[in-house]
Amino acid sequence: EVEKTACPSGKKAREIDESLIFYKKWELEACVDAALLATQMDRVNAIPFTYEQLDVLKHKLDELYPQGYPESVIQHLGYLFLKMSPEDIRKWNVTSLETLKALLEVNKGHEMSPQVATLIDRFVKGRGQLDKDTLDTLTAFYPGYLCSLSPEELSSVPPSSIWAVRPQDLDTCDPRQLDVLYPKARLAFQNMNGSEYFVKIQSFLGGAPTEDLKALSQQNVSMDLATFMKLRTDAVLPLTVAEVQKLLGPHVEGLKAEERHRPVRDWILRQRQDDLDTLGLGLQGGIPNGYLVLDLSMQEALS
């Protein structure tokens, strides 16, 4: 709390300008009118205030707007945003995408902070859903944003927004998140032709069920190994050797290098060795010829 002291003669600020950098904390408190500061917030970011000086300016705005800042002030906070707490931000009502962009610009290159997370949460809740423009903006600043959301939060993403998602935005998503996103992507891209569809859907395939993988295997898609390794194990296991061969095309040779890793390892254990031998890759570990294959999935589920 800054002590209340009278402003020295001739030091009363007529406008927000660079002369204020020479003011001590108590002089800023005494000589800068909060209403003047609010109307000239756009000038603050051009002035090299220290964090301590920014604390004083924030204190003045807090006194002027105890219920939360208006959007006209929020849009021009600049580096002052770095001094806001999540509690401050929860009082705001940010509706303009331009305001969101301005504040994310200040945080460009920073790790996702509690302040930014709160700002985004307030903005998205205010909009009711994660629309395409918002998602475009957020993933441009934070490529990992989508994967930071819970499956429940992702369920509010409309399929139309999926067009804004880039492959790198899904890099850190786990299977539970892809389970939610995949059906939306399938819906969003449903009117595209085969090869174009595969290019778009590829990043989301970690959420694809077996039947969709079987369908893709009939379309000469030549899935790369990196994509195959991200598929759900339970979706890969029922695929036949012939289906995997068609799905991977020329990339099928890569299975040998991945034979000890999931899902390839588990898939090999489910295939007849005779069938694996037809690939000519030397894959070992399949079911020997003459053995009876029982489906234990029901038994596993019960135990």
Partner: antibody
Framework: QVQLVESGGGLVKPGGSLRLSCAAS????????MSWIRQAPGKCLEWFSY????????YYADSVKGRFTISRDNAKNSLYLQMNSLRAEDTAVYYC??????????WGQGTLVTVSS | DIQMTQSPSSVSASVGDRVTITCRAS??????LAWYQQKPGKAPKLLIS???RLQSGVPSRFSGSGSGTDFTLTISSLQPEDFAIYYC?????????FGCGTKVEIK
């Protein structure tokens, strides 16, 4: 008076890890943002990370992103830098500095990190 | 990233000389500029912030000026303890960046 003392430097092999510490005294540590800056032999100064007073706001330059982690313990008046996957180009004197926003007003004496096989 | 270019890279001068060092930013940084002095084996020491604000305890022979992209550090009358490397640094945008220094040597 304000004092910043770095420690933890030394010789490490490429791919190795090191943890630097910076002990602060003479000011209210929990009120201040803190930064790490480094200077490779005969090279320019490079600011590469900072952390806010509460620890909630963090920045990494691209040169260290994903490899270095900045943290602080306000109860111990200490700033830390965990450095993983070290490379030869990380060889430098590492300084911690008090960050006041428009400049760095106090610096430590530095600690030398040498990455070599 | 904003590039900071200092010139000259080194200057030879005598005690009592007036020395001027310039720093140019690759884009407008308003007055978000600081100057530091570094002596061999020592940490940099802040001289000037906000382009022209002299840090407490720094002799008045040091002065800074400029705004936008062009900045100047002036030592009005060089003293023996002033022989060192001088760096400029911008704080207008992240990442903060430094100039590569100007070495002030004895003539």
């Amino acid at each position: 008076q304000v004092q910043l003392v770095e420690s933890g430097g030394g010789l490490v092999k490429p791919g190795g890890s090191l943890r630097l510490s910076c002990a602060a005294s003479g000011f209210t540590f929990s009120d201040h943002y803190m930064s790490w800056i480094r200077q490779a032999p005969g090279k320019c100064l490079e600011w590469f990370s900072y952390i806010s007073s509460s620890g909630g706001i963090i920045y990494y330059a691209d040169s260290v992103k994903g490899r270095f982690t900045i943290s602080r313990d306000n109860a111990k008046n200490s700033l830390y830098l965990q450095m993983n996957s070290l490379r030869a180009e990380d060889t430098a004197v590492y300084y911690c500095a008090r960050d006041v926003g428009s400049h760095f007003d106090y610096w430590g004496q530095g600690t030398l990190v040498t990455v070599s096989s | 990233d904003i590039q900071m270019t200092q010139s000259p890279s080194s200057v030879s001068a005598s005690v009592g000389d007036r020395v001027t060092i310039t720093c140019r930013a690759s884009q407008d940084i308003s007055r978000w500029l600081a100057w530091y002095q570094q002596k061999p084996g020592k940490a940099p020491k802040l001289l000037i912030s906000a382009a022209s604000r002299l840090q407490s305890g720094v002799p008045s022979r040091f002065s800074g000026s400029g705004s936008g992209t062009d900045f100047t550090l002036t030592i009005s009358s060089l003293q023996p303890e002033d022989f060192a490397i001088y760096y400029c640094q911008q704080a207008k945008s992240f990442p903060r960046t430094f100039g590569c220094g100007t070495k002030v040597e004895i003539k």
